[in-house]
């Protein structure tokens, strides 16, 4: 069958607010192998933050960036 | 608490290739969002960023050292490592490693590591 | 790359002074910039993410400003325990650059 792709797990969660124009999308990590459930922003840099979805600067962020683009975030 | 420690040799000759390694301890190096890099500093200069490693794989060097440097990560042991080849006095510092939580900040260090190049 | 300039190189100030830092970028980075701290034979330290806010645990009595190409760290009430070199560190780019560093001495 096809290669499966790993788990993204995010151990630990950024302690810092991140600015929105540094923001380029975000996906959802809700994996049962995972141990927290997590959102995992991507930067300008085309790095991974990893983000406490109960936060509310890390949901207003997920909503600015569904404004921003009109596809569905998994 | 995460912390950081590097080790290898504190003596090298020229020519040679400088092998250092950093542990990772009190978290996982395998954390999506954490970004492993190394950084220098010449002795009485200021800080050179070398490069970074994801627990991926995917590195980034610092274009003015990257024929001569390779990250590599065991995911196994909680470790990355630098080694940097054709090596000459102007090697010669304190090699750091350091974290930073994707979002470009710096924000815990291991302790340093002084690398001296002479024969 | 970015060069990053700090001015002074260094400076001498007495306990209870307002001290000033200035870092200037080659061209517009916003407010991706971030201050440290280095005492000697120590590893730095990270006081200041985003030009301006202050790292968890860091005294208020050190700030940071500024936005495009220039930037300003400040230490309101100098304390004996401040002594160190500082350097910023621009992120709008990769690699990464730092500035060479102001060495703080005291009076």
């Known amino acids: 069958g096809p290669a499966s792709v790993p788990t993204t797990c995010c151990f630990n969660l950024a302690n810092r607010k991140i600015p929105l124009q540094r923001l380029e999308s975000y996906r959802r990590i809700t994996s049962g192998k995972c141990p927290q459930k997590a959102v995992i922003f991507k930067t300008k840099l085309a790095k991974d933050i990893c983000a406490d979805p109960k936060k509310k600067w890390v949901q207003d962020s997920m909503k600015y960036l569904d404004q921003k683009s009109p596809t569905p975030k998994p | 608490q995460v912390q950081l420690q590097e080790s290898g040799p504190g003596l090298v000759k020229p020519s040679q290739t400088l092998s250092l390694t950093c542990t990772v301890s009190?978290?996982?190096?395998?954390?999506?969002?954490?970004?492993w890099n190394w950084i220098r500093q010449h002795p009485g200069k200021g800080l050179e960023w070398i490069g970074y490693?994801?627990?991926?794989?995917?590195?980034y060097y610092n274009p003015s050292l990257k024929s001569r440097i390779t990250i590599s990560i065991d995911t196994s042991k909680n470790q990355f490592s630098l080694t940097l080849s054709s090596v000459t006095a102007a090697d010669t510092a304190v090699y750091y490693c350091?974290?930073?939580?994707?979002?470009?900040?710096?924000?815990?260090w291991g302790q340093g590591t002084m690398v001296t190049v002479s024969s | 790359d970015i060069q990053m300039t700090q001015s002074p190189s260094s400076l001498s100030a007495s306990v209870g002074d307002r001290v000033t830092i200035t870092c200037q970028a080659s061209?517009?980075?916003?407010?991706?910039l971030n201050w440290y701290q280095q005492k000697p034979g120590k590893a730095p330290k990270l006081l200041i993410y985003?030009?301006?806010n202050l790292e968890t645990g860091v005294p208020s009595r050190f700030s940071g400003s500024g936005s495009g190409t220039d930037f300003t760290f400040t230490i309101n009430s100098l304390q004996p325990e401040d002594i160190a070199t500082y350097y910023c560190?621009?992120?709008?780019?990769?690699?990464?650059?730092f500035g060479q560093g102001t060495k703080l001495e005291i009076k």
């Open positions: 350091a974290r930073d939580g994707g979002d470009d900040a710096f924000d815990i």
């Open positions: 009190g978290g996982s190096i395998s954390s999506g969002g954490n970004y």
């Open positions: 490693i994801y627990y991926s794989g995917n590195t």
């Open positions: 061209q517009d980075i916003s407010n991706y």
């Open positions: 985003d030009a301006s």
């Open positions: 560190q621009e992120y709008n780019n990769l690699p990464y650059s």
